[in-house]
């Protein structure tokens, strides 16, 4: 079937890097400057994909593969082949339509990115508070306060100021 | 194509004032939130201020708030940022950049940005 191809077609001889050129009856002509082609047989050139402003560029086009992108640092990647820059934050925010805020009370965020979710409910697994969580900390869950009858534990967990284990409603 | 272009700066002394503008082309201004954004020499990128598509809501940083106003004319296609009140660490290359059509929970990201105008501030 390639063969058949071939003779039927001369485009399709045409390697990757190059396109086949309608105007010099259907020759292999290199991609321009600033294109490429991907796989063979092709009949026009993709432009490169330019990385500028708030992108960078990680991997320079060739005529055979387009132009990879990164953000600019203080950003991060979205979308399949870096197609946005999104802000990053601190550690204990997120991001909002109105920039960085702070997580609120019961609730943590320990990345540069994404949102703030609740604190562990210890209770919930029948586990006490053993270290109280932060804007930028999960709570650590200790034994259960069964667990912690005299002599069962070394461990004695900090009596709390406050039971941290939800989120406000 | 989709294109923005940013003009407006120069060099400024302290407690000067500049307008930044950015022209659009290439798809339906008013359809996007737009931002700026700015790089000082050495540091990180840093977002400074967005607004939605009518103007309605604007934000801004901590670092510029009440000096410095983003808005728009979506009959010509333009953004601006007034900058009153500069301070030499307001010496960055200023960008500005396409936000989302709809902006979610999801996501704030920019999908374009302009090459950048550059403003020094110094005496």
């Known amino acids: 079937f390639e063969r058949t191809r071939s003779l039927q077609d001369p485009c399709s001889n045409c390697p990757a890097g190059t396109f086949c050129d309608n105007n010099r009856n259907q020759i292999c002509s290199p991609c321009p400057p600033n294109s490429f082609s991907s796989a063979g047989g092709q009949r026009t050139c993709d432009i490169c994909r330019q990385c500028k402003g708030v992108f960078r560029t990680r991997k320079e086009c060739s005529s055979t593969s387009n132009a990879e992108c990164d953000c600019t640092p203080g950003f991060h990647c979205l979308g399949a082949g870096c197609s946005m820059c999104e802000q990053d934050c601190k550690q204990g925010q997120e991001l909002t339509k109105k920039g960085c805020k702070d997580c609120c009370f019961g609730t943590f965020n320990d990345q540069k990115r994404g949102i703030c979710r609740p604190w562990t409910n210890c209770s919930l697994d029948g586990k006490s508070v053993l270290v109280n969580g932060t804007k930028e900390r999960d709570v650590v869950c200790g034994p259960s306060p069964a667990d912690l009858s005299p002599g069962a534990s070394s461990v004695t967990p900090p009596a709390p100021a406050r039971e941290p284990g939800h989120s406000p409603q | 194509e989709v294109q923005l272009v940013e003009s407006g700066g120069g060099l400024v002394q302290p407690g000067g004032s500049l307008r930044l503008s950015c022209a659009a082309s290439g798809f339906t201004f008013g359809n996007y939130w737009m931002i700026w954004v700015r790089q000082a020499p050495g540091k990180e990128l840093e977002w400074l201020a967005n607004i939605n598509q009518n103007g309605s809501e604007r934000y801004y940083v901590d670092s510029v708030q009440g000096r410095f106003t983003i808005s728009r004319d979506n009959a010509k296609n333009s953004l601006y940022l007034q900058m009153n009140s500069l301070r030499a660490e307001d010496t960055a290359v200023y960008y500005c950049?396409?936000?989302?059509?709809?902006?979610?929970?999801?996501?704030?990201?920019?999908?374009?940005s302009g090459q950048g105008t550059t403003v020094t501030v110094s005496s």
């Open positions: 950049a396409r936000g989302g059509a709809d902006y979610s929970n999801s996501h704030y990201g920019m999908d374009v």
